[in-house]
C-alpha cells in the first residue's frame, strides 16, 4: 500500500541584515505569476551562494514569505514584491512559511511523522 | 536544475543574421530569468542580452542589432541578431536562473545565473 505524503506547515520571524551584494535571493509568485496553482503568494525560488540569507541559514527554497517589516504580500504584483524587497532598507524582517514534507506510513494508519494528534 | 539546449548557429557573411533559440526543460519556464552569453576564442565570456519579468537588457555592442524574446508556451528564449560582424564571432551560451532577484539586478554578471547550456558557434566572415 502505497503512503501518504503530509505536510507540516510552520511560521517563522526571519530577520535579515542587507550584505554588500544585498538580501541574497530570488523570489516567484505574486497575482501575475502565479508559481504555485490557486496561490498568487510569493516564494523563495534561490538563495545565493554566500548571500545574507544563506550566511543566516533559516530562510530556504520553497518558503513562502508572507509579509516584509510588516507589510503583507498578499495580492502583489510580482515586480511590486520585488520592489517592495529592494526598498526594505538595510534591516529587513520576513514573516515566513516553512513547509516540510512528510512521509508517513500506509493510509490508514498513522507512521511516526505524522504531525496530526 | 533546468536543462538548456542551443540551437541556430551557424556561418553567415557580414551583415547577415541569424536566429538562436534556447529550449529549457523546466515545467515554470515563465518564471526564470534567461540571458544570453558569448565566449570568443582568448577572450572572457561576454553578457550579450537577458529578459526577466520586467523587460530586456541588452550590451552596448549589441543594442539596435540584437533583440531577446521568449515564447513561454513553447519554454524558449530566442536570439535574433541582424547586421552582423565579424566580431560578433564567438561561441553563444544560454543561461537561466527562476525567479526574480531581490537584489539590484546585475544582467551581465554570470553568478545571477544557475544553469547553461552547453552553446552553439556563431562565425561571422
Known amino acids: 500500500m502505497n503512503g501518504r505524503v503530509d505536510y507540516l506547515v510552520t511560521e517563522e520571524e526571519i530577520n535579515l541584515t542587507r550584505g554588500p551584494s544585498g538580501l541574497g535571493f530570488n523570489i516567484v509568485g505574486g497575482t501575475d505569476q502565479q508559481y504555485v496553482s490557486n496561490d498568487s503568494g510569493i516564494y523563495v525560488s534561490r538563495i545565493k551562494e554566500n548571500g545574507a540569507a544563506a550566511l543566516d541559514g533559516r530562510l530556504q527554497e520553497g518558503d513562502k514569505i508572507l509579509s516584509v517589516n510588516g507589510q503583507d504580500l498578499k495580492n502583489l504584483l510580482h515586480q511590486d514584491a520585488v520592489d517592495l524587497f529592494r526598498n526594505a532598507g538595510y534591516a529587513v524582517s520576513l514573516r515566513v512559511q516553512h513547509r516540510l514534507q512528510v512521509q508517513n506510513g500506509p493510509i490508514g494508519h498513522r507512521g511516526e511523522g505524522d504531525p496530526s494528534g | 536544475d533546468v536543462q538548456l539546449v542551443e540551437s541556430g548557429g551557424g556561418s553567415v557573411q557580414a551583415g547577415g543574421s541569424l536566429r538562436l533559440s534556447c529550449t529549457a526543460s523546466g515545467r515554470t519556464f515563465s518564471t526564470y530569468t534567461m540571458a544570453w552569453f558569448r565566449q570568443a576564442p582568448g577572450k572572457e565570456r561576454e553578457f550579450v542580452a537577458a529578459i526577466s519579468w520586467s523587460g530586456a537588457y541588452y550590451a552596448d555592442s549589441v543594442t539596435g542589432r540584437f533583440t531577446i524574446s521568449r515564447d513561454n508556451a513553447k519554454n524558449t528564449v530566442y536570439l535574433q541578431m541582424n547586421s552582423l560582424k565579424p566580431e560578433d564571432t564567438a561561441v553563444y551560451y544560454c543561461?537561466?536562473?527562476?525567479?526574480?532577484?531581490?537584489?539590484?539586478?546585475?544582467?551581465?554578471?554570470?553568478?545571477?545565473?544557475?544553469?547553461w547550456g552547453q552553446g552553439t558557434q556563431v562565425t561571422v566572415s
Open positions: 543561461a537561466a536562473v527562476i525567479g526574480s532577484t531581490v537584489d539590484s539586478y546585475r544582467p551581465g554578471d554570470p553568478l545571477e545565473y544557475d544553469d
